[in-house]
């Protein structure tokens, strides 16, 4: 598995994965008290036939063709937690492991 | 964690997974020996704000709204194997479980 | 009903050669693979060959690998195998077997002899 | 080669009886396991695919289990017709093997 990796300054027209930092404060999401901030990425770019798939049932629904089946899309293949503290809206603060917080590789699933 | 299912006669627009049978007889996909066809469904329809969103990350996409990012696509968010029998190209047959070849549900991603 | 039916047994004298086929019907040859399996008097079973529905895969193990030829003619529905440089220890009922993730309906077989 | 081990390699049973029949591979083999039914001067005929389906007009007293390296095939309660050879064979990879057999014969 791997993914192509991007900046604001790539000229790359395929799936690729771009840094994208999420400032909670930026929000007015005042509920979270850390982080502030962090790098979550994001996924942009074509899909061309077969370039980055995931999955093998992609390629057999591309295969197929169904009524109304879009082709696949650039999405994240796999992400990772956040360590995270914040109200949860009960008056308690929790201290919790938030999954799929951020994007580690972009792929067309 | 829930998802639409939908059939060929739903009149549903929004992101649904949708039945589909591979034949991969009909692919002249002929190093497989079983199964000769499955139930592999796939995913389609319109991703509005928030519909079906898997991730927390994919809200966060479309607040910080970088510049390239698409907004989420129909996608499956759980997928599970199917066990094959073939040959490897290399004059053997294997069996194995070979994954994400079934589409359980379907979300915006 | 699925039916399978070898033919071309018979005696062979050490060093021969024999063809053997499977004539296939109630069902889509074409669709499935096809394997042999052999009996030697009073013992198990052992698999020969596997052949892909399309024939562009086969697979042998080494008891018979580069002696051992399976083929398939999907228009006449008929499965073969060549046997060829035979030793006493082929000697063996021959079974034809459709292939699925088992072989689910087999041939009633034919006897090979390999005797001087 | 993945080796095939039936146990017992014969048995005495009676009309009634539950019949447990094991067969053990030398490796994982997942649930690639196969059980077949021979009757002298008969070809074998396919009872349980994939270590725990039952084959199509296979009698439900017939029933498999197991995955891994540890399988067994169990006639719940035999009729006159069940006494023959069972053999076991695993599909996981080539070669293709057999266990030895195991006859059942009439107590």
């Known amino acids: 598995d791997f993914g192509l990796d991007c900046d604001e300054h790539s000229t790359e027209s395929r799936c690729c994965r771009y840094p994208l930092t999420v400032d909670f404060e930026a929000f007015g999401w005042d509920w979270i008290i850390a982080p502030k901030r962090y790098k979550a990425n994001y996924c942009s770019g074509e899909c061309e036939f077969v370039f980055l798939q995931k999955y093998p049932h992609t390629h057999l629904v591309h295969q197929a063709n169904p009524r109304g089946s879009a082709g696949p899309c650039c999405t994240p293949t796999k992400m990772s937690p956040i360590n995270m503290l914040y109200f949860n809206g009960k008056e308690q603060i929790i201290y919790g492991k938030i999954p799929a917080m951020v994007v580690d590789r972009c792929g067309c699933s | 964690d829930f998802g639409l299912d939908c059939d060929e006669h739903s009149t549903e627009s929004r992101c649904c997974r949708y039945p589909l049978t591979v034949d991969f007889e009909a692919f002249g996909w002929d190093w497989i020996i079983a199964p000769k066809r499955y139930k592999a469904n796939y995913c389609s329809g319109e991703c509005e704000f928030v519909f079906l969103q898997k991730y927390p990350h994919t809200h966060l996409v479309h607040q910080a709204n970088p510049r390239g990012s698409a907004g989420p696509c129909c996608t499956p968010t759980k997928m599970s194997p199917i066990n094959m029998l073939y040959f490897n190209g290399k004059e053997q047959i294997i069996y194995g479980k070979i994954p994400a070849m079934v589409v359980d549900r379907c979300g915006c991603s | 009903e699925v039916q399978l039916l070898e033919s071309g047994g018979g005696l062979v004298q050490p060093g021969g050669s024999l063809r053997l086929s499977c004539a296939a019907s109630g069902f889509t040859f074409s669709s499935y693979a096809m394997s042999w399996v052999r009996q030697a008097p009073g013992k198990g079973l052992e698999w020969v060959s596997t052949?892909?529905?399309?024939?562009?895969?086969?697979s042998y193990p080494d008891s018979v690998k580069g002696r051992f030829t399976i083929s398939r003619d999907n228009s006449k529905n008929t499965l073969y195998l060549q046997m060829n440089s035979l030793r006493a220890e082929d000697t063996a009922v021959y079974y034809c077997?459709?292939?699925?993730?088992?072989?689910?309906?087999w041939g009633q077989g034919t006897l090979v002899t390999v005797s001087s | 080669d993945i080796q095939m081990t039936q146990s017992p390699s014969s048995l005495s049973a009676s009309v009634g009886d539950r019949v447990t029949i094991t067969c053990r591979a030398s490796q994982s083999i997942s649930t690639a396991l196969n059980w077949y039914q021979q009757k002298p001067g008969k070809a074998p005929k396919l009872l349980i695919y994939s270590a725990s389906s039952l084959q199509s007009g296979v009698p439900s007293r017939f029933s498999g289990s197991g995955s891994g390296t540890d399988f067994t095939l169990t006639i719940s309660s035999l009729q006159p017709e069940d006494f023959a050879t069972y053999y076991c064979q695993q599909s996981y990879s080539t070669p293709l093997t057999f266990g030895g057999g195991t006859k059942v014969e009439i107590k």
């Open positions: 052949i892909s529905s399309g024939g562009s895969y086969t």
């Open positions: 077997a459709k292939q699925d993730y088992a072989m689910n309906y």
